[in-house]
């Protein structure tokens, strides 16, 4: 089952997600999506990182932590009731079926 996080309408929501960098120090690609983690990738992507940087995001969705040290926690700005639901943080570790998937439930009140 998903871990539940709460935020109030008009405030910022924080959805934590972390990974340990490989010994090479290379960043692991990460995607955030609205909806539970599918078999591959993320559905309804709101933010994505690659081996170098944050390479895609939409308004209101950003990273407040040090993503280059494995903190890929998502901040959603000025939330509304429509932001309620499941979010997927997917750590896209190279190799077959190696991804780490985290489903987080956001409840807006």
């Amino acid at each position: 089952s998903e871990v539940e996080y709460r935020a109030e309408v008009g405030q910022n929501a924080y959805l934590p997600c972390f990974y340990t960098l490989p010994t090479s120090g290379t960043l692991v690609p990460v995607c955030w999506g609205k909806g539970a983690c599918p078999v591959f990738e993320c559905g309804n992507v709101v933010l994505r990182t690659d081996e170098r940087d944050v390479n895609y995001w939409t308004s209101r969705y950003w990273l407040n932590g040090d993503f280059r040290k494995g903190d890929v926690s998502l901040t959603i700005e000025n939330v509304t009731l429509a932001d309620s639901g499941i979010y997927c943080c997917r750590i896209q570790i190279p190799g077959i079926m190696n991804d780490e998937k985290f489903n987080l439930k956001l409840v807006i009140k």
Epitope: R52, W57, S59, R60, W62, G65, D66, E77
Partner: antibody, heavy 121, light 107 residues
Framework: QIQLVQSGPELKKPGETVKISCKAS????????MSWVKQAPGKGLKLMGW????????TYADDFKGRFAFSLETSASAAYLQINNLKNEDTATYFC??????????????WGQGTTLTVSS | DIVMTQSPATLSVTPGDRVSLSCRAS??????LHWYQQKSHESPRLLIK???QSISGIPSRFSGSGSGSDFTLSINSVEPEDVGVYYC?????????FGGGTKLEIK
């Protein structure tokens, strides 16, 4: 293509107010912050701060708290720098520069052409 | 605030030379170091981010290295159009201070 176009040169007297504009095009305005950078004549670059273009929340460097104000006109994809109670030492070129909103992403990938402000009695 | 110190202040080179510009931070900033080029009467242009990452559209003769508090911008084979002032920037801690710049001149 992505462009940041700033307003023209300004000549002001001490004590007056100036408002410099920076109009963005070629990308979704609210997905990037906008920074302001000061360059005094013959000197280096000094970050004044930045504004979150989605929320409108400004962040000012210590040396630019008080007389300086960042603002937005989101519908026009424009950011503004206002300086009140102008002083001679405000004479400089002011640049706007695009900044991703993420806290640890602080490189400036696109810059305006600069607005020269001269403050003289 | 983190203080960024660049050296030398001025560098006079011959076209074709390989040059190295130095930047030192007053405390460790990991690899959160960015380099900019500013030509006379122009706005700055991002050359390198995160100490060594190349930027699309920037000639491959520009490269960066370093981590912690010591960083280097290298120009593999200087061309006449490379004249200008080069600034490093702390990208780790607000207010994201810039170095004083290194002026590159052609002999």
């Amino acid at each position: 293509q992505i462009q940041l176009v700033q307003s023209g040169p300004e000549l002001k007297k001490p004590g007056e107010t100036v408002k410099i504009s920076c109009k963005a095009s070629g990308y979704t305005f609210t997905t990037y912050g906008m920074s302001w950078v000061k360059q005094a004549p013959g000197k280096g670059l000094k970050l004044m701060g930045w504004i979150n273009t989605y929320s409108g929340a400004p962040t000012y460097a210590d040396d630019f708290k008080g007389r300086f104000a960042f603002s937005l006109e989101t519908s026009a994809s424009a950011a503004y720098l206002q300086i009140n109670n102008l002083k001679n030492e405000d004479t400089a070129t002011y640049f706007c520069a695009r900044k991703p909103p993420h806290y640890y992403v602080n490189s400036f990938d696109y810059w305006g052409q600069g607005t020269t402000l001269t403050v003289s009695s | 605030d983190i203080v960024m110190t660049q050296s030398p202040a001025t560098l006079s080179v011959t076209p074709g030379d390989r040059v190295s510009l130095s930047c030192r931070a007053s405390q460790s900033i990991s690899d959160y170091l960015h380099w900019y080029q500013q030509k006379s009467h122009e706005s700055p242009r991002l050359l390198i981010k995160y100490a060594s990452q190349s930027i699309s559209g920037i000639p491959s003769r520009f490269s960066g290295s370093g981590s912690g508090s010591d960083f280097t911008l290298s120009i593999n084979s200087v061309e006449p159009e490379d004249v200008g002032v080069y600034y490093c920037q702390n990208g780790h801690s607000f207010p994201y201070t810039f170095g004083g710049g290194t002026k590159l001149e052609i002999k």
